[in-house]
């Protein structure tokens, strides 16, 4: 999946002038102005050029312009560690004018027994140790401080928390004579939050806990605990929210069942079942109470844990997620897809769509991909004409307005965006797919034929000729 797709921009129209909001009252910290994109979806590039020039005129002496990097801080409490006992940490880029804090949890699968953790340690050590972490990282996508790359929250305080606990951010066990590895994912989050309070988080208005892949599942597992932690520490006014990207997995039946020998081929339920025991994993209290002892693994699956959460969570999930397909033993490697597999893949999209029907804030494009929010071109994909940054902006507004009794969605500002077309890449704004063997970009028609879809069969239920359907797909209608 990684690096396999390029992103393309669609044609855009010129924008009307942007709307501004009233200035803050005297003595209030200056907040980044929320941008209302209602009228400017058409030509984001031109609008962003205006915003950038405005932003730069507002910060003539600011280091913001000069330095895009987040700086590494290893935890002061060195008992909170990565797998190998080295201190965990976080990368931070402060934005002193802002009361928004974005904490991003990195992803990277997991390991669930001594053998596959040993192998992970010897091949992917940066995911188990802080010993070789770079001093700085560049923020990309939702972690970017450039308004054109991150129209949603470019001016927030940005925190990237590297994943070095291999436990889907759930573990609470330290390294000992008995345990070769520490699994402290849940404790790392708590300690990062505690240390950030001394670095300005105490004055936050909103804390958005975001994450991709295993980090996305980590959001679902930890968002309520973070809210509870801040309340207990005397900061009940900080609104805690979650943004879970590519971490909403299904405990479905694998396409081909294989024994649980490694992380990739092990069925997700079995991997998590084994993992929880190995990591001493903790799950949200309200979810845990819904399941018997030994059944806590259920809480790692979004559709089961989500209804138990108190904090608002926005779910971002590709309908045909590559990590989901991997654990389901579906490997698309360039051979045309047989009908049984094609139906399995279509059904996966249908099942996923069904699990999101009661998730009011969701963005689920019908694409074959994995992760989105820290990709530089995360703004490019649209569902029903709305981009993800725009949907997140609408979500912010809906939460801001939620003290009003009305539960109706804001007019022209949707937050429930789930593609309804039934096959991979039926959404023309999907990331471009490359043929895995030739490296060539494939258009939608080539991709669908490669996937074994007969254009006649696809077009018929829509009441279209195959040529008409292809035209529509190519034009993005």
């Amino acid at each position: 999946s990684e690096g396999r797709k390029t992103w393309r921009r669609r044609g855009q129209q010129p924008p009307p002038p942007p709307r501004t909001e009233a200035a803050p009252a005297a003595g209030q910290p200056v907040e980044s102005f929320p941008l209302d994109f209602t009228a400017v979806e058409g030509n984001m590039d031109s609008f962003m050029a205006q915003v950038k020039s405005l932003a730069q005129s507002l910060y003539p002496c600011s280091a913001q312009q000069l330095n895009e990097d987040l700086r590494l801080h290893l935890l002061l409490d060195t008992s909170v560690t990565c797998n190998d006992g080295s201190p965990a940490g976080y990368y931070l880029k402060e934005s002193r004018g802002s009361r928004r804090w974005l904490l991003f949890l990195e992803g990277g699968w997991y390991c669930f027994n001594r053998e596959n953790c040993d192998s992970r340690y010897d091949t992917m050590r940066r995911l188990m140790s802080s010993r070789d972490w770079p001093r700085t990282r560049t923020g990309t996508g939702i972690l970017s401080s450039q308004p054109e790359e991150n129209p949603y929250w470019w001016n927030a305080n940005m925190v990237f928390i590297p994943y070095c606990s291999s436990d889907v951010w759930s573990g609470a066990s330290s390294k000992s004579e008995k345990n070769e590895y520490a699994f402290m994912g849940a404790l790392i989050i708590q300690e990062v939050v505690r240390e950030l309070l001394g670095r300005g988080l105490s004055g936050a208005k909103v804390l958005l806990l975001a994450g991709s892949s295993a980090g996305g599942t980590g959001v679902l597992l930890n968002v309520d605990r973070v809210a509870e932690q801040l309340e207990k520490l005397g900061y009940p006014a900080i609104q805690v929210r979650g943004l879970a990207d590519s971490g909403w997995f299904l405990d479905n039946k694998q396409y081909r069942h294989t024994d649980c020998v490694d992380t990739i081929t092990c069925a997700p339920t079995e991997a998590i079942r084994r993992g929880i025991r190995y990591w001493n994993g903790v799950v949200p209290e309200r979810c845990r109470r819904q399941f018997q002892e030994g059944e806590e693994w259920n809480c790692f699956f979004g559709y089961k844990v989500y209804p138990t959460l108190r904090c608002p969570v926005f779910v971002v999930q590709w309908l045909f997620d590559e990590a989901q397909l991997t654990v389901d033993n579906v490997h698309l490697t360039g051979q045309p897809v047989q009908e049984g597999l094609r139906l399995y893949i279509q059904n996966l999209g249908r099942e996923l769509r069904h699990t999101l029907k009661d998730v009011p804030a969701s963005f689920a494009p019908a694409c074959l991909s994995h992760e989105i929010i820290i990709r530089s071109h995360w703004t490019d994909v649209q569902v029903k004409g709305t981009s993800l940054p725009r949907a997140l902006h609408c979500w912010d507004r809906s939460l801001h307005d939620s003290h009003k009794a009305s539960k109706t969605p804001l007019k022209g500002c949707p937050v429930h965006l789930v593609d309804s077309c039934p096959w991979p890449h039926c959404n023309p704004s999907c990331p471009t797919v490359r043929d895995q063997f030739t490296g060539q970009e494939m258009n939608v028609a080539q991709f669908l034929m490669h996937m074994g879809f007969d254009m006649q069969t696809v077009a018929q239920p829509q009441g279209l000729e195959p040529s008409e359907l292809l035209g529509m797909l190519s034009n993005g209608s």
């Epitope: 990684e2 040993d118 091949t123 490697t333």
Partner: antibody, heavy 119, light 111 residues
Framework: DVQLLESGGGLVQPGGSRKLSCAAS????????MHWVRQAPEKGLEWVAY????????YYADTVKGRLTLSRDNSKNTLFLEMTSLRSEDTAMYYC????????????WGQGTSLTVSS | DIVLTQSPASLAVSLGQRATISCRAS??????????IHWYQQKPGQPPKLLIY???DLESGVPARFSGSGSGAAFTLNIHPVEEEDAATYYC?????????FGSGTKLEIK
């Protein structure tokens, strides 16, 4: 200077046993996963076995499972490969290789030791 | 196990021209932003030498005429311009999961 030096090869009869060694120097041996790779005459490379950095996990290719035992002595910076029930198809050059821990690629190879299984 | 299929088995390239070797995996070897495919060069009587790691990173000391690309399950090694000393056998190798495996090799001859 990082170095790996294999020894213990030679001529062995079918059904016999042999213990190969790999002496490491110039790096912290206990920090790295170590592997054996072999190459039959005029053939390609075949991955044989892996020992984790701590020595707690070993993994073998199916072709050698049950006949090979991999071990390491981190205090002596040495990797061992004990081979039993040897067959003619085990005839090969045996290389010991260090796996980088930021990707598992073999960034350092020994010169190899040649094993011939023949009567 | 992940099977690596290398092609062609051999190729002859004129001095100064481009050599392209392909390596296909039976399933994706990419995860968490990295592709776990590596390329080695082996000359007769010598151990293999690392050229490219993680699909596209050039090992230090290796000439810039060697380059690697690809992700997912499809990878390519390019040599351009080919020099006399590049005559050797080239192997791809994956380290995505155990057991590791190698491709069958491509023998490059300089015309």
């Amino acid at each position: 200077d990082v170095q790996l030096l294999e020894s213990g090869g030679g001529l062995v009869q079918p059904g016999g046993s042999r213990k190969l060694s790999c002496a490491a120097s110039g790096f912290t041996f206990s920090d790295f996963g170590m592997h054996w790779v072999r190459q039959a005459p005029e053939k390609g490379l075949e991955w044989v076995a892996y020992s984790s950095s701590g020595g707690t996990t070993v993994y073998y290719a199916d072709t050698v499972k049950g006949r090979l035992t991999l071990s390491r002595d981190n205090s002596k910076n040495t990797l061992f490969l004990e081979m039993t029930s040897l067959r003619s198809e085990d005839t090969a050059m045996y290389y010991c290789a260090r796996a980088s821990y930021d990707g598992g690629y073999f960034d350092c190879w020994g010169q190899g030791t040649s094993l011939t299984v023949s009567s | 196990d992940i099977v690596l299929t290398q092609s062609p088995a051999s190729l002859a390239v004129s001095l100064g021209q481009r050599a392209t070797i392909s390596c296909r995996a039976s399933k994706s070897v990419s995860t968490s932003g990295y592709s776990y495919i590596h390329w080695y060069q082996q000359k007769p009587g010598q151990p293999p030498k690392l050229l490219i790691y993680l699909a596209s990173d050039l090992e230090s000391g290796v000439p810039a005429r060697f380059s690697g690309s690809g992700s997912g399950a499809a990878f390519t090694l390019n040599i351009h311009p080919v020099e006399e000393e590049d005559a050797a056998t080239y192997y791809c190798h994956h380290s995505r999961e155990l057991p590791f495996t190698f491709g069958s090799g491509t023998k490059l001859e300089i015309k």
